[in-house]
Interface confidence: low
């Protein structure tokens, strides 16, 4: 017997559906109506036939009362080929829900997204996460998707993007966006970062994550941030193969004074990189290849420095007379 595609936990909190049959019984998903967290994985299916069975242009207001009654706050949709028209139809209906966090992963969006009708209401998300989502529209996908969202988005995560650079002139500002995560885009690089950080479109960013994005030097990242006018409080550059030295002919880049936390862990560093901010509250240099303790003049003025997992430290022990510099936690490097 084939297992049930959908499983709802005992608390009616989390519901996970895995539709792997070639012609799944989508009605099974109705058991998720009472769940707060819903995950739907479509097994790589092409959802084009769905368009024949639903009226994507129907007025979504007719479903408003039903949708408002749903408990879902977090929705994940994955592993499917989705016509843009169907995605838009879903977003229009979900606009009447209490959905706050939407995750799209392993999706191929085909066709172009129509413009938002005047009478339509946007989806009031606080968090949007995309992983390995490809769009037929290339660089304009963010602008097209953005028009279906209300401007209160606080968290945007884009991983394994096929086009991590955006068509900046089409993108509107994200006035409430405080966290931007572009991690796991290894082809991005510093120039790509410049293209992705559309100037003046991300005025409120406080947390910027750039793990595994092909960054080369902190100075290069500093330049890209300065060019875009982005001033994060926290910057994560971990899991990049960073160079410690700066091109001697390259001028110093002035870091924003707003930056107080910098993560340089798992960066393959054999010495503390040049060109760091002069003053930081938090600096994470754990799990690098530092063969000796950094000299004070190699470091920024820093309140909380993490050095665990470097060769010069015997795991689990602090430096003599410098115990306060280490968290004492032994990471698995």
């Amino acid at each position: 017997t084939t297992p049930e595609p959908c499983e709802l936990d005992d608390e009616d909190f989390r519901c996970v559906c895995n539709f792997s049959e070639p012609q799944p019984d989508w009605s099974e998903a109705f058991q998720c109506v009472s769940a707060v967290e819903v995950e739907i994985h479509a097994g790589g299916l092409n959802l084009e036939p769905f368009l024949k069975r639903v009226d994507a242009d129907a007025d979504p207001r007719q479903y408003a009362d039903t949708v408002k009654a749903l408990r879902v706050r977090r929705l994940t949709v994955g592993a499917a080929q989705v016509p843009a028209q169907l995605l838009v139809g879903a977003l229009r209906v979900l606009a009447y829900s209490r959905l706050k966090e939407l995750t799209l992963e392993d999706l191929k969006i085909t066709g172009t997204m129509p413009p938002l009708p005047l009478e339509a209401t946007g989806l009031a998300l606080s968090s949007l996460r995309l992983r390995n989502v490809s769009w037929a529209t290339g660089r304009s996908w963010l602008a097209e998707l953005q028009q279906w969202l209300k401007p209160g988005l606080k968290v945007l995560s884009i991983a394994q993007a096929h086009s991590p650079a955006f068509s900046c002139e089409q993108v509107r500002a994200f006035p409430a966006l405080t966290s931007l995560d572009l991690s796991d885009n290894p082809g991005l690089g510093e120039r790509g970062l410049m293209a992705a950080l559309c100037p003046h479109k991300f005025p409120a960013i406080q947390n910027l994550a750039l793990r595994n994005t092909g960054m080369e030097t902190p100075t290069g990242v500093c330049a890209a941030l300065a060019a875009a006018g982005v001033q994060p409080h926290s910057l994560d550059l971990s899991h990049n193969s960073l160079r410690a030295t700066v091109n001697p002919s390259a001028p110093r880049c002035m870091w924003s004074s707003a930056l107080n936390s910098l993560n340089l862990s798992f960066a393959g560093l054999e010495q503390v990189p040049k060109g760091l901010p002069a003053k930081l509250r938090v600096l994470d240099l754990s799990c690098n290849r530092l063969n000796r303790a950094p000299q004070p003049d190699e470091l920024p003025e820093v309140d909380n420095l993490t050095l665990d997992g470097n060769p010069f430290l015997v795991p689990g022990t602090a430096l003599p007379h410098e115990g306060s510099m280490n968290s004492g936690v032994v990471p698995a490097c």
Partner: nanobody, 122 residues
């Protein structure tokens, strides 16, 4: 200091072709959008074509299908291949680039070339 050096302008007959080149030099870190604009006497400068770092091009309606913009990121250069030229294409052509450059610190701003004259006569 950053400079944009244009070349390739000149006088041609209607229906002929020209290729304009523009190279950015100086303390350049990276170059964002690049483009070509033109201006006739007494008129506003108008966009002819622009191209972003990824190679996505935009054209003015008047030149679509006749002009092709391209760039070489390694050389910080932009080119404009102009085919089927007509008298309305007569103008001074200006190169434009959005450049992250190095002075005392990093800066990013638009730079303009000095312009190169293109004259099309019948």
């Amino acid at each position: 200091q950053v400079q944009l050096q244009e070349s390739g302008g000149g006088s041609v007959q209607t229906g002929e072709s020209l290729r304009l080149s523009c190279v950015a030099s100086g303390n350049i870190r990276s170059v964002g959008d690049m483009g070509w604009y033109r201006q006739t006497l007494g008129d506003q400068r108008e966009m002819v074509a622009t191209i972003d770092y990824g190679g996505v091009a935009r054209y003015a309606d008047a030149v679509k299908g006749r002009f092709t913009i391209s760039r070489d990121n390694a050389k910080s250069a932009v080119y404009l291949q102009m085919n089927s030229l007509n008298r309305e294409d007569t103008a001074v052509y200006y190169c434009n680039a959005d450049i992250l450059y190095k002075s005392d610190s990093y800066a990013r701003r638009e730079f303009w070339g000095q312009g190169t004259q293109v004259t099309v006569s019948s």
